[in-house]
């Protein structure tokens, strides 16, 4: 059945922690992605940004999770108003920013 929101959020946080702790070489060869507004529709916005990174084994599971948590189909090259389109950051920074925000949501009990 569907993953309960609290479980989904916790799993995603654990995966992002795993990425940040195990990072040795530049994550995803230093690939750059669009920064996003960490607000409503965050899972889809994060996916729309990260889906444009290919060949990066470290974030494959994160991409899978975000794809499962986003209710609509997302393809590479697809953009929405949820992006801060004038700002690109490294995947490593994107992951750190996302992780900090998700931890905050988890502490506040905002699971959806």
């Amino acid at each position: 059945g569907p993953v309960p929101p609290s479980t989904a959020l916790r799993e995603l946080i654990e995966e992002l922690v795993n990425i940040t702790q195990n990072q040795k070489a530049p994550l995803c060869n230093g690939s750059m992605v669009w920064s996003i507004n960490l607000t409503a529709g965050m899972y889809c916005a994060a996916l729309e940004s990260l889906i444009n990174v290919s060949g990066c084994s470290a974030i494959e599971k994160t991409q899978r999770m975000l794809s499962g948590f986003c209710p609509h189909k997302v393809s590479a090259g697809q953009f929405s108003s949820l992006h801060v389109r004038d700002t690109k950051i490294e995947v490593a920074q994107f992951v750190k920013d996302l992780l900090l925000h998700l931890k905050k949501l988890f502490r506040e009990g905002q699971f959806n």
């Epitope: 993953v3 995803c28 290919s54 494959e60």
Partner: antibody, heavy 118, light 111 residues
Framework: EVQLKESGPGLVAPGGSLSITCTVS????????INWVRQPPGKGLEWLGM???????DYNDALKSRLSISKDNSKSQVFLEMNSLRTDDTATYYC????????????WGQGTSVTVSS | DIVLTQSPASLAVSLGQRATISCRAS??????????MHWYQQKAGQPPKLLIY???NLESGVPARFSGSGSRTDFTLTIDPVQAEDAATYYC?????????FGGGTKLEIK
């Protein structure tokens, strides 16, 4: 335009080793993963392994002890090496690129035919 | 390893009719709400060509007469209506778990 092209020895003696090069164009190996797949004559497809853009290598455990996959990003080349060859390793060997998530193989080379025979 | 069993091994379908190919996985290929099952077409003397990804999504440039469905362990590729140029062998493939595996293939003949 995305292209992949395999080049191999054609004929290899039993017990010998095989080296195949996949030369790609139209994309960067730092950003894309490359799979190796083989197909014996008249039979189905078998995944051998892959090398990710970030350098991680995944092998098919059934062949891992005989396989080595590597790449040279600057030359846009991926290499497959296989040792202790047997006659049942006779096949067409393909390299194939993973597309974006969900990482299905969206572009394939034409394949190179390898015959293991004395 | 996840074993993919395709059926039938071969089928002959009249031009303009529907062709249905089944792929059954030995365990679920679903992960976080997606089915990591893909379909390929291989014509004689050519490499495989991606048709469908994530069970039901049509690859760019593939005609709409191809469609995919299914989840967990049971998947179907449908071609409706079949055209002469669809004569080929069709393979399912999963990448939910390593090693990636392919089905044994289904050879489609057009009557």
């Amino acid at each position: 335009e995305v292209q992949l092209k395999e080049s191999g020895p054609g004929l290899v003696a039993p017990g010998g080793s095989l080296s195949i090069t996949c030369t790609v164009s139209g994309f960067s190996l730092t950003d894309s993963s490359i799979n190796w797949v083989r197909q014996p004559p008249g039979k189905g497809l078998e995944w051998l392994g892959m090398i990710w853009g970030d350098g991680r290598i995944d092998y098919n455990d059934a062949l891992k002890s005989r396989l080595s996959i590597s790449k040279d990003n600057s030359k846009s080349q991926v290499f497959l090496e296989m040792n202790s060859l047997r006659t049942d390793d006779t096949a067409t060997y393909y390299c194939a690129r993973d597309g974006y998530f969900p990482y299905a193989m969206d572009f394939w080379g034409q394949g190179t035919s390898v015959t293991v025979s004395s | 390893d996840i074993v993919l069993t395709q059926s039938p091994a071969s089928l002959a379908v009249s031009l303009g009719q529907r062709a249905t190919i089944s792929c059954r996985a030995s365990e679920s290929v679903d992960s976080y709400g997606n089915s990591y099952m893909h379909w390929y077409q291989q014509k004689a003397g050519q490499p495989p060509k991606l048709l469908i990804y994530l069970a039901s999504n049509l690859e760019s440039g593939v005609p709409a007469r191809f469609s995919g469905s299914g989840s967990r362990t049971d998947f179907t590729l449908t071609i409706d209506p079949v055209q002469a140029e669809d004569a080929a062998t069709y393979y399912c493939q999963q990448n939910n778990e390593d090693p990636r595996t392919f089905g044994g293939g289904t050879k489609l003949e057009i009557k």
